[in-house]
């Protein structure tokens, strides 16, 4: 049940990431650590790297408020789960600084990709033999 809540939150975060992608030109063009092809059992560690990244509004135009609200939602800590706690203690996961740094557009694309991977794993884990290739 706790894991379900977590994944439901991930699904909602995908929408927020998609919204932010529409305002990518209004974000500070700073390079941010963006995990990609995250190894199994390091997903939660990579997720926390995305949440810690200093994504910022460029404070230009009329979109500043909606951008800041969306960034705040992205950074909201999900409820703790055993899976998350187990992974947190994995010393073998790369540190945030070790991931390649990318501008906001690619950062958001990679964040979305990780969220999709986590949801898909969750859905597949409930279904015996669901993965076909």
């Amino acid at each position: 049940q706790g894991q379900d809540r977590h994944m439901i939150r991930m699904r909602q975060l995908i929408d927020i990431v998609d919204q932010l992608k529409n305002y990518v030109n209004d974000l500070v063009p700073e390079f941010l650590p963006a995990p990609e092809d995250v190894e199994t059992n390091c997903e939660w560690s990579a997720f926390s790297c995305f949440q810690k990244a200093q994504l910022k509004s460029a404070n230009t135009g009329n979109n500043e408020r909606i951008i800041n609200v969306s960034i705040k939602k992205l950074k909201r800590k999900p409820p703790s789960t055993n899976a998350g706690r187990r992974q947190k203690h994995r010393l073998t996961c790369p540190s945030c600084d070790s991931y390649e740094k990318k501008p906001p557009k690619e950062f958001l694309e990679r964040f979305k990709s990780l969220l999709q991977k986590m949801i898909h794993q969750h859905l597949s884990s409930r279904t015996h033999g669901s993965e076909d290739s």
């Epitope: 049940q1 379900d4 439901i8 699904r11 909602q12 995908i14 929408d15 998609d18 694309e109 979305k112 990709s113 999709q116 949801i119 898909h120 859905l123 597949s124 409930r126 279904t127 669901s130 993965e131 076909d132 290739s133």
Partner: antibody, heavy 117, light 107 residues
């Protein structure tokens, strides 16, 4: 705004292979999940399967032995092949995007495929 | 497979009416439920995901609730453009499955 458009023959003979293509515009196919759903005349919707842009697939077990979904990122297209068709495969076939993995946020208008000799 | 049962199969209503459609899953699906609106010859439209989250661009008169096995889609004040068929869809496990649909008709 992402738009999807199905294309392919509207008539297929029994025992042959149904082939449809979905062309995606207004967005890149190189992220997200891309699926096929069908609706036989007078019936409800049935999920056929989907493919992740990086190649992994999930299929409905009821169709699994006959279905192949593939993606062509260079053309921003994905396709459906359904082999050994019968009259029961007559349906409106929809292609759709699933950004959230669990639901479909953009759909094509659908294309009617009739299986008949 | 998880069976999704919608009721009623059709409902007659007038503009301004409050309309409620229910969807029942054959087993618990947490909040993994989506609702779609479908008009003949048009592309289906996602209204609600994870049971109660409103899809971007969908009017606030649409709302979803429920968890476990019982779910509800409510249209608070029916508009002329809302006459359509509505489907629920579960995503708790593969295969993804849809309800049989509820047709909302003009009274």
């Amino acid at each position: 705004q992402v738009q999807l458009q199905e294309s392919g023959p509207g008539l297929v003979k029994p025992s042959e292979t149904l082939s449809l293509t979905c062309t995606v515009s207004g967005g890149s196919i190189s992220s997200d999940f891309w699926g096929w759903i069908r609706q036989p005349p007078g019936k409800g919707l049935e999920w056929i399967g989907y493919i992740y842009s990086r190649g992994s697939t999930n299929y409905n077990p009821s169709l699994k032995r006959r279905v192949t979904i593939s993606v062509d990122t260079s053309r921003n297209q994905f396709s459906l092949k359904l082999s050994s068709v019968t009259a029961a495969d007559t349906a409106v076939y929809y292609c759709a995007r699933s950004a959230g993995v669990t639901d479909f946020d953009f759909w094509g208008q659908g294309t009617l495929v009739t299986v008949s000799s | 497979d998880i069976q999704m049962t919608q009721s009623p199969s059709s409902v007659s209503a007038s503009v301004g009416d409050r309309v409620t459609i229910t969807c029942r899953a054959s087993q618990g699906i947490s909040s993994w439920l989506a609702w779609y609106q479908h008009k003949p010859g048009k592309a289906p439209k996602l209204l609600i995901y994870v049971a109660s989250s409103l899809q971007s661009g969908v009017p606030s008169r649409f709302s979803g609730s429920g968890s476990g096995t019982d779910f509800t889609l409510t249209i608070s004040s029916l508009q002329p453009e809302d006459f359509a068929t509505y489907y629920c869809q579960q995503a708790n496990s593969f295969p993804l499955t849809f309800g049989g649909g509820t047709k909302v008709e003009i009274k």
